[in-house]
């Protein structure tokens, strides 16, 4: 019996087609992805093959103005239109709290939404009961297939699930659910979830009875043969893991942003064992036409987005200096504003010992593309912010050693004075540079804001300590020459859309007045500073 698994993950509100790098589509003849194009390909496969499942491994939420405006209603509507068979909850599905998941998505989806390792307690237990499930048995042709869901255990640090949801260890939670399905004679089981490729492989190895793992969160691109676009494969598709009980378990993921449709064909014997598996992600490029009816629906929903982007979010009573003459040379108040918004967006009081789990932010000055003038009645709109942050990136959470951060700050000024983008703006960090010293030895003081304290204060950076830092995904991926971040990071979790983070902060504050306040200091001659 042959099953075709079509899968997406980490779509992050790319409902419309995008450019090759998943930012805004500029030249339509070269654009990719989007739900209208995805639907064309899915329908083509459904017509050609008998047993097809369309699955999503989480993080549909968050990523473009679509989510900012429609808050998940767009996800339910278009996933229903594409007739998804099941979805796993990702960490970003909790970005607007549990209510922001229940009302727009859980109550509206015509497909099961799954997670076996999220347990509701207290008053939420009855409210959310039955709205998401640990597993769902689906009819596929004349057979049945069990789908078991899982979600990153790190979600309380990455999103806003509140205090009444407990995120258990994935493997511990999955095993009894899979055992139950086996007891119920369901002999073909897919684990569908959102914990990243390393956990996907562990699930394949450790959870007895799981036949296939369909994952997300780490934006992993797998491919067999010559890859069709810019993504470099992390391994073959499917990635085969040998389980502890000696089975070959295919593990798949399909990069992100709806650029590819994962396509996996599995052959099962009559006892539900996987005999063979093969496939590849399908690049959804312009050779695949956009479905006209879905496209028309997208255009109808688009209208509200254009109206939204010109509405006032809040006011500034100071000039927001985002000029390259400032932000690439010294502390600029636009950089301070953005970093403050980044930290504010990551306030998660999950431990009594810590006022917050993260206090530090770094931001490449070259990523700030425009100032905002206060002499326009002080008005700030989404459109204004899109000029400041035009790249459609995310503000991510990483864990780094102090020594890596020190290297990053050396890199920040290694060729100071040439208006290069790597000059870092900061939050929760005080840095002093001596630019008369040779490159690679210019950081003379680096103090960071404590987290395990009731009164936040600045302490010298410790080289061997592990710190959490919020930064643009561009930096986490080694952009602007920050190779040391990419090479040495200990953990990387994708965050919220950059513009969304700043717009939410401005709406929350109502009136802003960021100052230049001595976070970054530089001098061109020797002072008596001690090295740390």
């Amino acid at each position: 019996w042959e099953l075709t698994i079509l899968h997406t993950n980490d779509v992050h509100s790319r409902l419309e087609q995008t450019s090759e790098d998943s930012s805004k589509c500029v030249n339509a003849s070269r654009c990719m992805g989007g739900v209208a194009r995805l639907f064309t390909k899915v329908q083509q496969i459904r017509r050609a093959e008998p047993n097809v499942l369309l699955l999503d491994a989480g993080d549909q939420y968050q990523g473009t103005i679509w989510f900012t405006v429609y808050k998940g209603a767009e996800v339910a509507h278009f996933m229903n239109a594409l007739r998804y068979d099941a979805m796993a909850l990702g960490n970003h599905e909790f970005d607007n709290g549990v209510e922001g998941l229940i009302e727009p998505l859980l109550k509206e989806a015509k497909f099961p939404i799954l997670s076996a390792n999220i347990k509701a307690k207290g008053p939420l237990a009855s409210q959310i009961s039955g709205l998401y499930l640990p597993y769902k048995v689906l009819p596929v042709g004349d057979e049945v297939v069990g789908i078991v869901g899982y979600t990153s255990k790190e979600t309380p640090f990455l999103s806003n699930p509140g205090t009444n949801l407990v995120f258990e260890d994935e493997i511990t939670a999955l095993q009894p659910e899979v055992d139950k399905l086996k007891t119920l004679n369901v002999n073909k089981i897919i684990a569908l979830g959102h914990s990243g490729f390393e956990m996907d492989k562990l699930i394949a190895q450790k959870v007895r009875g799981v036949d296939v793992v369909v994952g997300g969160h780490s934006n992993t691109f797998l491919y067999t043969g010559n890859p069709p676009s810019k993504e470099v494969p992390a391994g073959k598709y499917p990635f085969i893991v040998t389980s502890d009980d000696g089975r070959k378990v295919p593990v798949v993921q399909a990069y992100a942003f709806g650029k590819y449709l994962g396509y996996l064909k599995i052959e099962f014997d009559e006892r539900g064992n996987v005999i063979s598996s093969h496939g590849n992600p399908i690049l959804l490029n312009s050779s695949i036409p956009e479905d006209p009816s879905i496209k028309a629906d997208i255009n109808k929903w688009r209208i509200k987005l254009d109206n939204y982007s010109t509405q006032e979010l809040g006011k500034t009573i100071v000039y927001l200096d985002g000029s390259s003459q400032s932000c690439r040379f010294r502390e600029c108040n636009m950089g301070n504003l953005i970093c403050d918004a980044m930290i504010n967006n990551n306030l998660r009081h999950t431990d009594e010992m810590f006022w917050n789990h993260v206090s530090m932010c770094i931001l490449n000055g070259g990523g700030i593309r425009s100032p905002i003038d206060e002499r326009n009645n002080g008005t700030i709109t989404w459109e204004n912010l899109a000029a400041v942050l035009p790249f459609g990136g995310t503000f991510d959470l990483v864990q780094l050693k102090g020594s890596t951060l020190k290297k990053a700050f050396e890199h920040s000024v290694h060729r100071y004075g040439q208006s290069t983008g790597e000059f870092l703006q900061v939050g929760g960090i005080h840095v002093v540079y001596d630019l008369s010293r040779k490159p690679g030895d210019r950081v003379v003081k680096l103090d960071v804001l404590c987290t395990k304290c009731r009164v936040p204060s600045y302490d010298p950076l410790k080289m061997d300590e592990v710190y959490k830092v919020i930064l643009p995904n561009f930096l986490a991926n080694g952009g602007d020459g920050f190779q040391m971040i990419k090479d040495e990071l200990l953990r990387h979790d994708s965050g919220d859309q950059d513009i969304n983070v700043v717009s939410t902060y401005i709406s929350k504050m109502k009136v802003i007045y960021p100052a230049v306040e001595g976070r970054i200091k530089a001098h061109h001659h020797h002072h008596h500073h001690h090295h740390h």
């Epitope: 099961p112 597993y135 769902k136 689906l138 009819p139 139950k180 399905l181 119920l184 004679n185």
Partner: nanobody, 128 residues
Framework: QRQLVESGGGLVQPGGSLRLSCAAS????????IGWFRQAPGKEREGVSC????????YYADSVKGRFTISRDNSKNTVYLQMSSLRAEDTAVYYC?????????????????????WGQGTLVTVSS
């Protein structure tokens, strides 16, 4: 082989009663949400009544509330639908369906999601 077999259908006069049975083989019914659905000629299939395995909670479509009663006997691996005060509009093929997923009885009956196991159906005709 897993099977759901419905029985008890037939011809009955308006106002009369019938009891439908759904016998399960190859199923541990305790773990399943079971539903009765019906399809009248030229109409969509609709959920009539559903019962859970664990807490025995039930759901009834508005059109049958107070007239139909769903029950289950796990020792016999059978679910029943007692139908009384039958009307002409109750004429349909009645299907039994089962889902081992922990869906609510309401979600099962709507049905919100595809249901994996179905019987062949039994015809109920209400006519004078």
């Amino acid at each position: 082989q897993r099977q759901l077999v419905e029985s008890g259908g037939g011809l009955v006069q308006p106002g009369g009663s019938l009891r439908l049975s759904c016998a399960a083989s190859g199923f541990l019914l305790d773990y399943y949400v079971i539903g009765w659905f019906r399809q009248a000629p030229g109409k969509e299939r609709e959920g009539v009544s559903c019962i859970s395995g664990s807490d025995r909670s039930t759901y009834y479509a508005d059109s049958v509330k107070g007239r139909f009663t769903i029950s289950r006997d796990n020792s016999k691996n059978t679910v029943y639908l007692q139908m009384s005060s039958l009307r002409a509009e109750d004429t349909a093929v009645y299907y039994c369906a089962a889902d081992p997923s922990p869906v609510t009885v309401q979600a099962m009956c709507l049905p919100r999601f595809p249901v994996p196991y179905w019987g062949q159906g039994t015809l109920v005709t209400v006519s004078s």
